[in-house]
Amino acid sequence: VEVQVSEDPVVALVDTDATLRCSFSPEPGFSLAQLNLIWQLTDTKQLVHSFTEGRDQGSAYSNRTALFPDLLVQGNASLRLQRVRVTDEGSYTCFVSIQDFDSAAVSLQVAAPYSKPSMTLEPNKDLRPGNMVTITCSSYQGYPEAEVFWKDGQGVPLTGNVTTSQMANERGLFDVHSVLRVVLGANGTYSCLVRNPVLQQDAHGSVTITGQPLTF
């Protein structure tokens, strides 16, 4: 028996369902009574789901997994993982034993889009050219960690005096805060781009300083 899985990682959004594809080629006359199927976390050997002795033994992993029972006899051993969490990320191995055996591993990459950044300025009044200001760009509830880029109004990257911190909340999602310290010119636009490297999703925020008032 030969087990096949997708070579590319499966990307799943937090709180959505994901399918980890696994298939085998049943011989003519194959019946489910012959099938032994085990899904396991590759790095820890934790049992996730199993089908043995002709029946689905159910989820051993927080009751959020399911097989496709009607498709098993056709060789579809895929696993459905419901309400994906950050902690589900990793490698899963599909083990199949009929008359002989095989196994293959598939990676699950979890992702969550970042919110549109909010921009704050400190100080936020009595600003004059030559003043040092702190611009903070904050974006929330994303995964995995973001890449943050700053540019001026001409699109020139600003790399000096940037401090970025990322903190995971109790669900494992990241809140990103990036601080740019800059000396004000006569006027100018400062934009922050928060990129999710897995989703290739960019979230933009900008602040324009033209004397008073400020434009966000």
Epitope: N36, Q40, D43, T93, S97, I98, D100, F101, S103
Partner: antibody, heavy 123, light 107 residues
Framework: QVQLVESGAEVKKPGASVKLSCKAS????????MHWVRQAPGQRLEWMGE????????NYNEKFKSRVTITVDKSASTAYMELSSLRSEDTAVYYC????????????????WGQGTLVTVSS | DIQMTQSPSSVSASVGDRVTISCRAS??????LAWYQQKPGKAPRLLIY???SLDSGVPSRFSASGSGTDFTLTISSLQPEDFATYYC?????????FGQGTRLEIK
């Protein structure tokens, strides 16, 4: 070639602890799960637990879970097994075993064995 | 835990004989079964994995079969170096468990 060299024989009193070592060579230490299997005189083999040296993850036989601790020192390519609250029934030969066939089976195949360490528990 | 039961517990045979050892699992284990040979004072040696696959270096006189709950190990023509104790092991579930062993003695 793969070699697993275990520490020497131990004699312990009931209630004491013993810590055995297993020095691995001939392969990349972090790439094979390491197991501990024991065999009391005239008895069947008994799996105690395992460790993934790459990430430190352990799985234990529930029978021993409260008494056994398996660790590794990656820099020394050495695995350790500590068994506490020893009793006379723990008298056995203790083997460390490396499993290079991890993807083949859901649990383990015991391919490379150490020479064994005799632990005698006696008052 | 999955119980593994071997039969017979011991068997006497002569060089050149054909010998069969059985192993039964208390629940279905597919083909995730291994066989080991152990000689006195030595560590066990893996002979068979996945119920029927010979490990490298194992002579072809050893063969094995089975799936589900019933498995057999066969030595087609006993050689002097085959007299030892043989163990089966299930590799599907934790805790990993072994049979009680079958001692193969010279008649």
């Amino acid at each position: 070639q793969v070699q697993l060299v275990e520490s020497g024989a131990e004699v312990k009193k009931p209630g004491a602890s013993v810590k055995l070592s297993c020095k691995a060579s001939g392969y990349t230490f972090s790439s094979y799960w390491m197991h501990w299997v024991r065999q009391a005189p005239g008895q069947r083999l008994e799996w105690m637990g395992e460790i993934n040296p790459g990430n430190g993850h352990t799985n234990y036989n529930e029978k021993f879970k409260s008494r056994v601790t398996i660790t590794v020192d990656k820099s020394a390519s050495t695995a350790y097994m500590e068994l506490s609250s020893l009793r006379s029934e723990d008298t056995a030969v203790y083997y460390c075993v490396a499993d290079p066939r991890r993807p083949k089976v859901p649990t383990a195949l015991f391919v490379y064995w150490g020479q064994g360490t005799l632990v005698t528990v006696s008052s | 835990d999955i119980q593994m039961t071997q039969s017979p517990s011991s068997v006497s045979a002569s060089v050149g004989d054909r010998v069969t050892i059985s192993c039964r699992a208390s629940q279905g284990i597919g083909t995730w079964l291994a066989w080991y040979q152990q000689k006195p004072g030595k560590a066990p040696r893996l002979l068979i994995y996945a119920a029927s696959s010979l490990d490298s270096g194992v002579p072809s006189r050893f063969s094995a079969s089975g799936s589900g709950t019933d498995f057999t190990l066969t030595i087609s023509s006993l050689q002097p170096e085959d007299f030892a104790t043989y163990y089966c092991q299930q590799a599907i579930n934790f805790p990993i468990t072994f049979g009680q062993g079958t001692r193969l003695e010279i008649k």
